[in-house]
């Protein structure tokens, strides 16, 4: 068996310093959560304690805050590309600046795989977006591989401002194909990484043939097995369980949102790429967590603009 | 056991060429990133080159930086250094190293026993 | 680049011994930092990464700590097999630069 540990966010919605637990800002620091900086504590924490370790986000980092309104994303590119994401789907918020709002701060600054198997450039943007984003990425992990498939709410061109020469297909219909690439490929574990909502992703898990796990976002769905740690109210238990029209059983999980909680789980992986067990939680990142010093130092770098701007 | 052997030098005139070899068994070889590093007779440790996992991006120094290329095979589980218009200051222990399995910079967790290279007239 | 500076680069220490190197990066470097032990004619060794991991195998008695640009590297109780040559290594970004190295050697 070979056991895999997924970290993921979603939704982060430019939350790059610490806030109040109902993720407004921060008025009492030692009450405070959340934050890139205290994100890279744990994630190193658990980088360090376990071998097998992803870093996934589920899309809609961008607007939010006085940060993206500043800094019109090259900020998720350098914090993420600091943390040391693996990889990111798109979310419709990437597309609020238009696609080139997406283009020149985070898709051509990021150091790690963008995602969106059902989005499709047309005309003159073709060319222009080629192998910027990709449908998925084979990422190896350790001795083993592991696929991740993109995908993105088909409701985005309502939602945001991806312009006319970008189509979103429908999700399940854009992803069984490339996940059929991956098994070409003897790629037997494969994580479905969205942002579509909650109910699509228990689709995604049910109707996708060789998807293995599925990390979702666009609904701030907050899962948690026993007593949750906050104020936010489970919608089911983490992960949560879909059998898969061929029978399987596959996690599908979320992490709220506002970089409140990291996403924690671990699945344990038979030598075929079967999903043998699942179990995690989200971690609350409260103040018993340190903002990673280094990181901090960085945020206030950048803060310097944002106190000027606000002035 | 995972295991990287260098293989490859030798005394060579400066402006002349060398190709050294490693290669790498006990682990999957085409998942990691891997680099080569050099030490110069009684001096310190040089990072000289990276190739990524998949080939798709190679970096080096200033100072090999248009005079030495980094490759791999991976269907043979071999990196190779071809260095060209060698000086006396190449002159150095080269090993070979193992990375990480990503696109970002890392540390070095194997090492092989090093290939020296001498170059003198 | 960023530079890499050790210090002392060279100190004499008994079997026992609680021995500190540090390594100063010139500029933060968050914790990606390495620490190897060389021996003379032999491959280096990894003990320590991310700043302060230590590496499978590698005893107890080493220990890293350090953020950003300030880091140090601790052997609790030098034992004989512990004289060699420490470098650090920054991982944060390309070129990869390592420390001019510190001899730990016998009083």
């Known amino acids: 068996a070979w056991e895999l540990t997924i970290l993921h966010t979603n939704d982060v919605h430019s939350r790059l310093e610490q806030t109040s637990e109902d993720s407004s800002k921060c008025v009492n620091a030692s009450r405070c959560m959340g934050g890139v900086a205290r994100l890279f504590t744990k994630v190193q924490q658990i980088r360090r304690a376990e071998p097998n370790v992803l870093l996934l986000d589920a899309g809609d980092q961008y607007q939010g805050t006085i940060w993206f309104t500043v800094y019109k994303g090259a900020e998720v590119a350098h914090f993420m590309n600091a943390l040391r994401y693996d990889a990111m789907a798109l979310g419709n918020h990437e597309f609020d600046n238009g696609v080139e709002g997406l283009i020149e701060p985070l898709l051509k600054e990021a150091k790690f795989p963008i995602l969106s198997a059902n989005i499709k450039a047309k005309g003159p943007l073709a060319s222009q977006i080629s192998g910027l984003y990709l449908p998925y990425k084979v990422l190896p992990v350790g001795d083993e591989v592991v696929g991740i498939v993109g995908y993105t709410s088909k409701e985005t061109p309502f939602l945001s401002n991806p312009g006319t020469n970008l189509v979103f297909e429908d999700e399940i219909t854009a992803l069984q194909p490339e996940v059929d690439k991956l098994k070409t490929l003897n790629v037997n574990k494969i994580i479905a990484l969205g942002h579509s909502g909650f109910e699509m992703d228990k689709l995604i898990a049910q109707k996708v043939r060789g998807v293995d796990v599925v990390v979702g976002g666009h609904s701030n769905t907050f899962l948690y097995t026993g007593n949750p740690p906050s104020k936010e109210v489970p919608a089911g238990k983490y992960p949560f369980i879909v059998t898969s029209d061929d029978g399987r059983k596959v996690p599908v999980v979320q992490a709220y949102a506002f970089g409140k909680y990291l996403g924690y789980l671990k699945i344990e992986f038979d030598e075929r790429g079967n999903v043998i067990s699942s179990h995690g939680n989200p971690i609350l990142l409260n103040s018993s967590i340190p903002e990673d010093p280094s990181i901090k130092a960085d945020i206030n770098k950048w803060r310097i603009k944002l106190d000027n701007y606000s002035t | 056991q995972v295991q990287l052997v260098e293989s490859g030098g030798g005394v060579v005139q400066p402006g002349r060429s060398l190709r050294l070899s490693c290669a790498a068994s006990?682990?999957?070889?085409?998942?990691?990133?891997m680099h080569w590093v050099r030490q110069a007779p009684g001096k310190g440790l040089e990072w000289v080159a990276v190739i990524l996992y998949d080939g798709s991006n190679k970096y080096y120094p200033d100072s090999v930086k248009g005079r030495f290329t980094i490759s791999r095979d991976n269907s043979k589980n071999t990196l190779y250094l071809q260095m060209n218009s060698l000086r006396a200051e190449d002159t150095a222990v080269y090993y070979c190293a193992r990375g990480g399995s990503s696109w970002y910079p890392d540390s070095f967790d194997i090492w092989g026993q090093g290939t020296m290279v001498t170059v003198s007239s | 680049d960023i530079q890499m500076t050790q210090s002392p680069s060279s100190l004499s220490a008994s079997v026992g011994d609680r021995v500190t190197i540090t390594c100063r990066a010139s500029q933060g470097i968050s914790s990606w930092l390495a620490w190897y032990q060389q021996k003379p004619e032999k491959a280096p060794k990894s003990l320590i990464y991310a700043a302060s991991s230590l590496q499978s195998g590698v005893p107890s008695r080493f220990s890293g700590s350090g953020s950003g640009t300030d880091f140090t590297l601790t052997i609790s109780s030098l034992q004989p097999e512990d004289f060699a040559t420490y470098y650090c290594q920054q991982y944060n970004s390309y070129p990869l630069t390592f420390g001019g190295g510190t001899k730990v050697e016998i009083k």
């Open positions: 006990g682990f999957t070889f085409s998942n990691y990133g």
